[in-house]
């Protein structure tokens, strides 16, 4: 089929030739019996552009057609063309351009003696001619016409219809429904694209996202979706994603962490009002916010600790002297003194030097404000010199030494390898130069180690190294020591200082000379 945008359709419906005469009033010859004049009628149709005065001459600018013989004299024509397969009714004139809305039409009824001779040039064959011009809008409706010329009548109708997928007044609008990546639409009455549900845009290629999907922060690949751009979330993609780790904060834009009231820090995790939210201070202490989620507690008397959770024991360590017993009071204490002592901490004695209160040879002197004091000899302490000093109690000896209390002094018995008053000096075990043959000595704890020069080994570097120890001879050779050197005795077929070379093979013969050498290798 010729590509076109529309089709002019002409439907021949009825032809009447009352007397069976030609246009020149002659009788149609070739009639097969009565009536004597029988016009075997066919038609020439010429469709052309609008002419004010229609010329029947070619060219038929919009198309032409010649029908087969359709009847004799007077006859009706059914839709579809009837028995003759060579003729279809209506006659179709395809258009490959915009329908202009006007046309000229020439229809000639012609007679032929033979159905095979449909020549139209002979004017003597003409029965009648219709020449008309019309305005015609595109549409499905048929326009009916009747042409009468004295002896003949021709009833016909015509229309111009758009081809499939063509629309508009001139069938110039192309629209083919589709539902693929290039569009999702059907076609309206005027050829406009009618988007399928869920699609929009001039070519219906843009999906309609989930209603409410944020225009800026959401998008979709198919209808009803709402996919979020980076930094946004939620069903409608209008919720910003906060800075990762943001705790008590919000955002207006992605990756923000705008702290809620009472919170601070990069992650809004620092409680700026810790005192109110957590009430950390105990026992009636005063709480002060210091920012960044921290606080300080000012304790009431008698309490201590970061949150004032600990009651202070004023009796620890015991302040009472001379065996007085201590009673813990709030933010204070009191001492109950044994007989013969008084004062806040039982530091004063009711005795005098006359009572001989100093022990272990302590020298007594009376105090002007009452009481006395003892000056203790070496090795004793206490108010009355009653305590013997243990000089070893402070563990003065180092490195596992034993401490011996001498009464007025101490002595450290050192472990092997250490010396000095406190046994903290490591004895130099290299002082006696124990490493032989130029070996380097390294001091240890009651020990030494030697780094030997090449050729020597052993704790003191006194043992020479065996030259054959590291198997310098290859390929099954035997190693022999020669003073400070070694000699390799090669296996048959090998040579070189270490027997590392394969010797060339000798040709077979009766007497093969043993060329194996005993080569000396340097140690």
């Amino acid at each position: 089929q010729v590509w076109s945008s529309g089709v002019f359709e002409l439907k021949l419906q009825e032809f009447v030739n009352k007397k069976g005469l030609l246009g020149n009033r002659n009788c149609c010859r070739g009639g097969a019996g009565p009536p004597p004049c029988a016009c075997r009628t066919f038609f020439r149709v010429c469709l052309k552009h609008y002419q004010a005065s229609v010329s029947p001459e070619p060219p038929c600018t919009y198309g032409s057609a010649v029908t087969p013989v359709l009847g004799v004299d007077s006859f009706s024509l059914p839709d579809g063309g009837g028995a003759d397969s060579a003729f279809s009714n209506p006659i179709r004139f395809p258009f490959g351009f915009t329908w202009p809305g006007t046309f000229s039409l020439i229809i000639e009824a012609l007679h032929t003696d033979s159905p095979d001779d449909l020549a139209t040039e002979n004017p003597e064959r003409l029965i009648s001619r219709l020449a008309t011009q019309r305005h015609l809008t595109v549409g499905e409706e048929w326009s009916q016409d009747l042409h009468s010329s004295g002896r003949t009548d021709l009833k016909y109708s015509y229309r111009f219809v758009c081809d499939e997928h063509y629309y508009g007044e001139g069938c110039s609008v192309f629209c083919r429904p589709r539902d693929d990546a290039f569009g999702h639409f059907t076609c309206g009455e005027r050829g406009e694209k009618v988007c399928n549900p869920g699609w929009k845009g001039p070519y219906c290629t843009e999906p309609i996202c989930l209603p409410g999907c944020d225009e800026q922060h959401g998008f979709c690949d198919k209808p009803g979706e709402c996919k979020c751009r980076v930094g946004w979330q939620g069903r409608y993609c209008d919720e910003c994603i906060r800075y990762p780790g943001c705790l008590h904060g919000t955002c207006q834009q992605p990756w923000q962490c705008n702290c809620q009231e009472g919170w601070g820090g990069l992650f809004c995790n620092q409680d700026l009002n810790y005192c109110t939210h957590h009430k950390p201070c105990k026992n009636g202490a005063t709480c002060t916010n210091t920012g960044q989620g921290s606080y300080t507690c000012s304790c009431r008397p008698g309490y201590t600790g970061a949150t004032c959770e600990l009651g202070i024991d004023e009796c620890d360590p015991s302040p009472c002297k001379n065996g007085g017993s201590c009673t813990d009071l709030e933010n204070s204490y009191s001492c109950t003194c044994p007989p013969g002592f008084y004062g806040k901490i039982c530091e004063l004695s009711a005795m005098t030097c006359a009572d001989g209160p100093c022990f272990n040879g302590g020298r007594c002197s009376d105090s002007p404000d009452g009481g006395y004091s003892c000056r203790c000899p070496v090795g004793y302490s206490g108010f009355n010199c009653e305590k013997k000093i243990d000089y070893c109690s402070s563990s003065p000896c180092s490195n596992g030494a034993k401490c011996v209390d001498l009464g007025d002094a101490y002595l450290c018995r050192c472990q092997a390898g250490f010396s000095g008053r406190h046994c903290d000096d490591n004895v130099d075990d290299c002082a006696s130069s124990p490493c032989a043959n130029g070996g380097t000595c390294r001091d240890g704890v009651n020990d030494f180690s030697c780094t030997c020069p090449p050729g020597y080994t052993g704790r003191n570097c006194s043992a020479p190294v065996s030259r054959c120890e590291h198997a310098p001879c290859h390929n099954g050779a035997t190693c022999h020591e020669r003073g400070h050197r070694y000699v390799c005795e090669c296996a048959r077929g090998y040579g070189g200082p270490n027997c590392q070379f394969l010797l060339p093979e000798l040709p077979p013969g009766p007497a093969v000379v043993d060329l194996t050498e005993k080569l000396e290798g340097q140690g």
Partner: antibody
Framework: EVQLLESGGGLVQPGGSLRLSCAAS????????MHWVRQAPGKGLEWVSF????????YYADSVKGRFTISRDNSKNTLYLQMNSLRAEDTAVYYC??????????WGQGTLVTVSS | DIVMTQSPLSLPVTPGEPASISCRSS???????????LNWYLQKPGQSPQLLIY???NRDSGVPDRFSGSGSGTDFTLKISRVEAEDVGVYYC??????????FGQGTKVEIK
């Protein structure tokens, strides 16, 4: 402080027209989708219309489709509702509301539309 | 359309006592991100509605902590732990999952006994 202020309500005869306005302040108007919600006297809340932040997408309740038109002027921070072919059943207080994640976080004080002959 | 059904429609309360309102949706309001798109509003007498709870259980800023939202899928509850005189008004639930249209419950009128 976010504020929404409706105006344009009043008494109108059936078949008449009215244009409501909603002046927004205290936030970036062009970043938010907006809605109209109405409440008939003594009745509950009824959603009326939606417009996207840029104004390219609009939706309507079936009861007003074809008669009401929602629009916005982001340069003036103003939302509009053009109401044509008004009926008695359109009588209500009309609220404009800001849209966020499926909820209306701020509402105007409302403007009363009375359709009566 | 998603249909929202509230109960009770009227709720007489005693100040200091707890109160509870139920809201049921005709289809699930759970999004793939796990959030429930169900919101609660209070309309005090002569005022515009105000947002109380959004997305199931999130209290809007400035809303007292005596208000709480719970539930998931199709069944939701608004609780007031201790009702105060200022809490009277009409409470509405609203689905924010699908539109058009967004739909509201019929409203629950809370009044002091």
């Amino acid at each position: 402080e976010v504020q929404l202020l409706e105006s344009g309500g009043g008494l109108v005869q059936p078949g008449g027209s009215l244009r409501l306005s909603c002046a927004a302040s205290g936030f970036t108007f062009s970043s938010y989708a907006m809605h109209w919600v109405r409440q008939a006297p003594g009745k509950g809340l009824e959603w009326v219309s939606f417009i996207s932040s840029g104004g390219s997408t609009t939706y309507y309740a079936d009861s007003v489709k074809g008669r009401f038109t929602i629009s916005r002027d982001n340069s003036k921070n103003t939302l509009y509702l053009q109401m044509n072919s008004l009926r008695a059943e359109d009588t209500a207080v009309y609220y404009c509301a800001r849209f966020r994640s499926g909820y209306f976080d701020y509402w105007g004080q409302g403007t009363l539309v009375t359709v009566s002959s | 359309d998603i249909v929202m059904t509230q109960s009770p429609l009227s709720l007489p309360v005693t100040p200091g006592e707890p109160a509870s309102i139920s809201c049921r949706s005709s289809q699930s309001l759970v999004h793939s991100n796990g959030a429930d798109y169900l919101n609660w509003y209070l309309q005090k007498p002569g005022q515009s509605p105000q947002l109380l709870i959004y997305k199931g259980s999130n209290r809007d800023s400035g809303v007292p902590d005596r208000f709480s939202g719970s539930g998931s899928g199709t069944d939701f509850t608004l609780k007031i732990s201790r009702v105060e005189a200022e809490d009277v008004g009409v409470y509405y639930c609203q689905q924010g999952y699908d539109f058009p249209p967004f739909t509201f419950g019929q409203g629950t009128k809370v009044e002091i006994k």
